[in-house]
């Protein structure tokens, strides 16, 4: 039977080395066996490159394409093929579809005067455009109480957050995770980082009296 695309490719770039496209077929498909995504930078002399997609679900395919350090002017021509049949054709400008890399190495340290210091790493090297453009969202949640959670927006440069222990329940186990976005690129949010967990052993002041 004929091969058809149900939801056409949606692509995002980490704006440093990789662009990822995902699409849905109209029936379960062995993506790597049946499909190929060709991509070519619209630039004089650029060669055509081929991405072999993988299955994310039965009918969902995903392709990760290595790209050079992206710049604003880059535009890629994309063609989705099933053998000799062209299923879809479109263009993709990485700078207009940025999904930042996930922040890394989230850690929690006890700090002076009953505060917790949350630290993580900026996922971009200093020379990359996005390094100084990222802002973060930190989600802190009580592992045993789904209603006890807080969201912090970190809009200053440093990848850190100071958290007063008194704002959390004493003796409770908390988990934190962080994600990033780049406002000037109108990006989507990055994926959440892996969670890190700690015990909030702050003793309320009243108990000292």
């Amino acid at each position: 039977g004929s091969v058809k695309v149900l939801h056409e490719p949606s692509c995002f770039s980490d704006y440093i080395s990789t662009s990822v496209c995902q699409w849905k077929m109209d029936h379960p498909t062995n993506c790597s066996a049946e499909l190929r995504l060709s991509y070519q930078l619209d630039f004089m002399g650029s060669e055509n490159h081929t991405c072999v997609p993988e299955n994310r679900e039965d009918s969902v395919c995903v392709c990760s394409m290595p790209i050079d350090d992206a710049v604003e002017a880059d535009v890629y021509q994309l063609d989705l093929w099933a053998g000799q049949q062209l299923l879809w054709s479109g263009s993709f400008q990485p700078s207009k579809h940025v999904k930042p890399r996930t922040p890394g190495n989230l850690t929690v340290h006890p700090n002076i005067s009953h505060t917790w210091l949350l630290m993580w790493t900026n996922p971009y090297p200093t020379e990359n455009h996005l390094h100084s453009e990222l802002t973060y969202m930190v989600n802190v949640s009580n592992d045993n109480d789904p209603e006890d959670f807080k969201v912090y927006n970190v809009t200053y440069m440093g990848p850190t957050l100071r958290l007063a222990a008194s704002t959390l329940k004493s003796g409770a186990s908390y988990s934190a995770r962080v994600r990033a976005w780049a406002q000037t690129y109108n990006s989507t949010w990055s994926d959440w980082s892996p969670s890190t967990t700690w015990l909030n052993y702050y003793e309320p002041w009243e108990q000292h009296l």
């Epitope: 930078l41 630039f43 004089m44 002399g45 650029s46 060669e47 055509n48 490159h49 290595p66 790209i67 050079d68 710049v71 604003e72 002017a73 880059d74």
Partner: antibody, heavy 125, light 112 residues
Framework: EVQLVESGGDLVKPGGSLRLSCVAS????????MTWVRQAPGKGLQWVSL????????YYADAVKGRFTISRDNAKNTLYLQMNSLRAEDTAVYYC??????????????????WGQGTLVTVSS | DIVMTQTPLSLSVSPGETASISCRSS???????????LDWYLQKPGQSPQGLIY???KRASGVPDRFSGSGSGTDFTLRISRVEANDTGVYYC?????????FGQGTKLEIK
Amino acid sequence: EVQLVESGGDLVKPGGSLRLSCVASGFPFRDFAMTWVRQAPGKGLQWVSLISGSGGKTYYADAVKGRFTISRDNAKNTLYLQMNSLRAEDTAVYYCAVDRLTKTIRPQYYGLWVWGQGTLVTVSS
Amino acid sequence: DIVMTQTPLSLSVSPGETASISCRSSQSLLYSIGYNYLDWYLQKPGQSPQGLIYLGSKRASGVPDRFSGSGSGTDFTLRISRVEANDTGVYYCMQGLQSPLTFGQGTKLEIK
């Protein structure tokens, strides 16, 4: 030493055909785009055509489109320019030159960093 | 097509002086920060052209530092300091950004 040696230039009548060759040595030929540039007697430089490293992409000046064909044989480290339906205004010295590195996603550009010695094509009855 | 315009078309300079050649493009040659696709070439009498400057300001291998390129977008300049007799020839600018590649008309440099 990086070197380009052109050959194939000749005297040919209008409407005739000619094939120029350019043999490359001293660099990874298949990784670089190659370009032909010509120079009419006493005139300036005019770009003719470019071919990517794999040969998959070709570009032509409007003046030669449909008449000239650029190609390459990476196994022989040789660039070609097939010239058909030649006209008097095609009379020129034809140079081959090494252009951008095209094995990367975005070609790396160094200008036309090596040129051949040129081969003269004369179109006259 | 991108039109390249060079000025002056001829230039006469005494040895040891500085020569400047201007090149203007009809469209911006800036692809991204620091990447202006503008080259300078020298064709000495009876010889093939040779590359001097690429990407606006980067010297080609073996080119003396007396040759320098500057400019961005649409306006570029080639400067040759401490001019020598050996610098005689025709200087061309060329845009390498998009097809068709286009050259300036050339500037003939004569040493007095």
